[in-house]
């Protein structure tokens, strides 16, 4: 059962796993949620009746029954982890804590103009977990405006104390705001020879990389595969760090793989969700339960629905035994990973999917697409919406993309002459315009947010957000697309598609069925040559065939230029402008979304 509210003046008795320090009960709840075993917590707020050394303690707790006895205690705030909840979870914490000093290892000290600048510095520093900033009112002159970057083994402060005229806060890496490079490559036959901060068992290098990503101290990793010569080290995932933030030495070693934490691209890549099955593989760990199940998929479902289950091993039924049902072993461990991984015993293993809700919804795999053909099929582009105006009559106005459960990203030029958001209707999950009837459900638009530097499409800033009146329930036919990572600026996208209901030639009409076209990206230098009368800025991105023939056209505006990278679709561009449609040597010009990620996050995460 999902319980989100906090219990004031209440303490949970027993079940302690560990104690950490957090600046608020709200953040204690987040820490508990992300901890592999924590189900409940008790936080101690500052209070004259409490010993100051206990202020800001966050005791993480577990219980076989998923609850613990409650005791009245002033200044104690207790609650449950969000593991039991189905809603999306984020570790992003933008709060600034006034008059609190969050203790950790102070590894960098510099002058900053403001707390915001200090927080940005922390976000863009590979080691930084949190910071403390001494304001200009700080009593000690030489410490004024000093920004201290800090880290700890756990990613949370080692202690928190009251200190006048300072502010503290956390890195915003988990808010997708880091400019650090996002290196997705996994290097085969490579060992990074740096200090290990931890080691866990993993079935493959991808899981190892994801574990590294959400481990607070891990910057890169080395994984020894099951063919590694030293038996005791097989399936070992070594989590590593270095002072420089990069591996100091790379050693060529067969059957080892290495890679980097995906911390700065984690909002657009799954890092918690280990959805694969591992055949002929047994995961060892503390046994939670043994239940009969028809298949390994059914076993995974059972594990996902059991809040304490972290991973499982399924042994298929022997012949006609037990009505064809196999045994499903639900398991857990102290760190969420198997204590040992064995091969060749016939088991099928995997992980709970409960943690998938900690990943961005946009990273969910969508159904395989139909290659070739220009008409799309249902569910092929589930982020694509059709934006209708009701003036003068109801009609398709522009395309748009779902980027959040209340947010559509589209082009600013779509709103020329639109005096009110009330006259707009957003339809999602639509393949054919003819499906839209008077009684078809739609999302009303609460607010149109146009970039304040927008003047006309050709001069850039052709980007707008629509805030919907109600939230979108994600399904197979309507779900968000990931924004590109700022760390992905140098990625060369090779699988890009433009979609929309727009014209198929310059003098045409809106198409009934959603059209798709695979279009190659064109460098900005090349694009500039084709548009000598315009300035093609780095905030624009171009796509098109030299010979023309495939392009976006009237009515496609605002829709997505979607590019697939590492199995995840990213919203690389917004259809903006071009000379004619599909003309030779006249590529389509799109708003370069990666350059507006900060703007998008600022507007969509505004309180």
């Amino acid at each position: 059962e999902c319980v989100t509210q906090l219990l004031k003046d209440t303490c949970f008795e027993g079940g302690d796993i560990t104690t950490v320090f957090t600046p608020s009960a709200k953040y204690c709840q987040v820490v508990c949620t992300y901890h592999p075993r924590c189900l409940l917590f008790t936080f101690t707020a500052e209070s004259p009746s409490e010993d100051p050394t206990r202020w800001f303690t966050c005791v993480l707790k577990d219980s076989v029954t998923e609850t613990l006895p409650r005791v009245n205690r002033t200044a104690a705030i207790s609650g449950y982890s969000f593991k039991q909840c189905s809603h999306q979870i984020s570790a992003c914490n933008k709060d600034i804590y006034v008059d609190l000093d969050m203790k950790g290892i102070n590894y960098n000290s510099s002058v900053a103009k403001s707390a915001q600048e200090c927080q940005e510095r922390c976000t863009d520093d590979v080691h930084c977990h949190f910071f403390t900033y001494a304001t200009r009112q700080f009593p000690s002159l030489e410490h004024r405006n000093i920004c201290l970057l800090k880290h700890t083994q756990t990613g949370t402060p080692t202690r928190i104390t009251k200190l006048d005229k300072v502010v503290s806060g956390f890195s915003l890496k988990s808010c997708a705001l880091s400019n650090l490079a996002c290196i997705r490559d996994i290097f085969p036959n490579t060992v990074f020879a740096d200090s290990n901060i931890d080691s866990v068992m993993a079935p493959d290098a991808f899981v190892c990389g994801r574990i590294c990503t959400h481990h607070p101290g891990c910057l890169f990793f080395t994984f020894f595969s099951q063919e590694w010569p030293k038996e005791s080290q097989r399936n070992l995932c070594l989590l590593k760090t270095s002072e420089s933030g990069l591996p100091s030495t790379r050693i060529k070693k067969s059957k080892a793989l290495s890679g980097f934490s995906l911390q700065s691209c984690r909002h657009s890549i799954p890092v918690f969700c280990h959805s694969s099955f591992y055949h002929d593989t047994d995961f060892l760990g503390e046994e939670l339960d043994i239940v009969a199940a028809k298949s390994h998929e059914a076993c995974q479902k059972l594990c996902t629905n059991a809040v304490r289950c972290q991973f499982f091993t399924y042994t298929p039924a022997q012949a006609s035994c037990n009505e064809g049902k196999g045994k499903c072993y639900l398991k857990l461990s102290s760190n969420g990973s198997p204590t040992k991984i064995l091969h060749g015993r016939g088991g099928i293993s995997g992980y709970t999917l409960r943690l998938c809700k900690m990943d961005n919804e946009c990273t969910t795999k969508i159904k395989p697409r139909i290659v070739g053909g220009t008409a799309s099929v249902r569910g092929e582009w589930p982020w694509q919406v059709t934006l209708h105006t009701t003036s003068p009559t109801q009609r398709h106005l522009c395309g748009g993309s779902i980027i959040g459960n209340q947010w559509i990203l589209t082009a600013a030029h779509c709103f020329y002459g639109v005096e009110s958001p009330k006259i707009l209707r957003v339809y999602s999950g639509i393949l054919n315009q003819s499906e839209i009837k008077e009684d078809t459900s739609f999302f009303g638009v609460q607010e149109i947010i146009i970039h304040d530097q927008y003047k006309m499409a050709e001069s850039g800033y052709d980007i707008a957000l629509l805030k919907l009146e109600t939230t979108v329930n994600y399904t197979d036919s309507q779900r968000p697309i990931c924004l590109p990572s700022k760390g992905d600026r140098n990625v060369i996208y090779t699988d890009c598609w433009v979609t929309g209901w727009g014209y198929r030639k310059l003098r045409d009409k809106i198409q009934n069925t959603l059209q798709k076209a695979k279009i190659p990206l064109v460098t900005n230098e090349e694009c500039q040559k084709r548009y000598r009368g315009h300035k093609i800025t780095h905030k624009m991105i171009c796509a098109g065939y030299r010979e023309g023939g495939k392009d976006a056209c009237k009515g496609d505006s605002g829709g997505p230029l979607s590019c697939k990278h590492n199995e995840v679709w990213h919203l690389v561009g917004i259809t903006s402008w071009g000379e004619g449609c599909a003309q030779r040597e006249r590529p389509g010009v799109y708003t370069n979304v990666v350059e507006y990620v900060d703007w998008i996050l600022e507007k969509t995460q505004a309180v």
Partner: antibody
Framework: QVQLQQPGSELVRPGASVKLSCKAS????????MHWVKQRHGQGLEWIGN????????NYDEKFRTKATLTADTSSSTAYMHLSSLTSEDSAVYYC??????????WGQGTSVTVSS | NIVMTQSPKSMSMSVGERVTLSCKAS??????VSWFQHKPEQSPKLLIY???NRYTGVPDRFTGSGSATDFTLTISSVQAEDLADYHC?????????FGAGTKLELK
């Protein structure tokens, strides 16, 4: 069922003004544009303008911009058209009509305005 | 403003005959054209929307066709109750405009 009720007739003096009403029922008044159309005796239909009751957004034909003012009262689901400085040229039947999903699907019975001294 | 020109201004028909009314737009209005039937002392009634879609309850002898600038309303077999004025109107862009109408009379 959708209904648009208009008073049958209005007799007004030249130079005066009149406020025509159109009471809507049977649908969500705020979610549809209400249009006003003029028909002089023996002539065609002329579009005056429209209003979106949920936001009070309006559009007018330039010809009627200084003549007509459109308003809506969402509490009573009534649309109004105020006509000012009336002359004999304004003598006509005035219809309110709902812009349905794709067209003007429901029409009021029309109010006959006679401008005479 | 988009001008909608209807022809003929009037026509006399016998019951059972096929009638074709024309409406031309001064510029491309895609398919944003409606046809209305208007009888004396009544309010106009919607027959066709989107150039070719028959409105609910309209007999299937009424058919609309055309796109861009040329539109047609066809009555396959005219009935006595079809005697009325017929107006086309465009809702592609503001200001909305109507044709002057075609009067359909009985011979």
């Amino acid at each position: 069922q959708v209904q648009l009720q208009q008073p049958g007739s209005e007799l007004v003096r030249p130079g005066a003004s009149v406020k025509l009403s159109c009471k809507a029922s049977g649908y969500t008044f705020t979610r549809y544009w209400m249009h006003w159309v003029k028909q002089r005796h023996g002539q065609g239909l002329e579009w005056i303008g429209n209003i979106y009751p949920d936001s009070d957004s309006t559009n007018y034909d330039e010809k009627f911009r200084t003549k007509a003012t459109l308003t809506a009262d969402t509490s009573s689901s009534t649309a109004y058209m105020h006509l000012s400085s009336l002359t004999s040229e304004d003598s006509a039947v005035y219809y309110c009509t709902r812009m349905g999903f794709y067209a003007m699907d429901y029409w009021g019975q029309g109010t006959s305005v006679t401008v005479s001294s | 403003n988009i001008v909608m020109t209807q022809s003929p201004k009037s026509m006399s028909m016998s019951v059972g005959e096929r009638v074709t009314l024309s409406c031309k737009a001064s510029e491309n209005v895609v398919t944003y054209v409606s046809w209305f039937q208007h009888k004396p002392e009544q309010s106009p009634k919607l027959l066709i929307y989107g150039a070719s879609n028959r409105y609910t309850g309209v007999p299937d002898r009424f058919t609309g066709s055309g796109s861009a600038t040329d539109f047609t309303l066809t009555i396959s077999s005219v009935q006595a109750e079809d005697l009325a004025d017929y107006h086309c109107g465009q809702s592609y862009s503001y200001p909305l405009t109507f044709g002057a109408g075609t009067k359909l009379e009985l011979k």
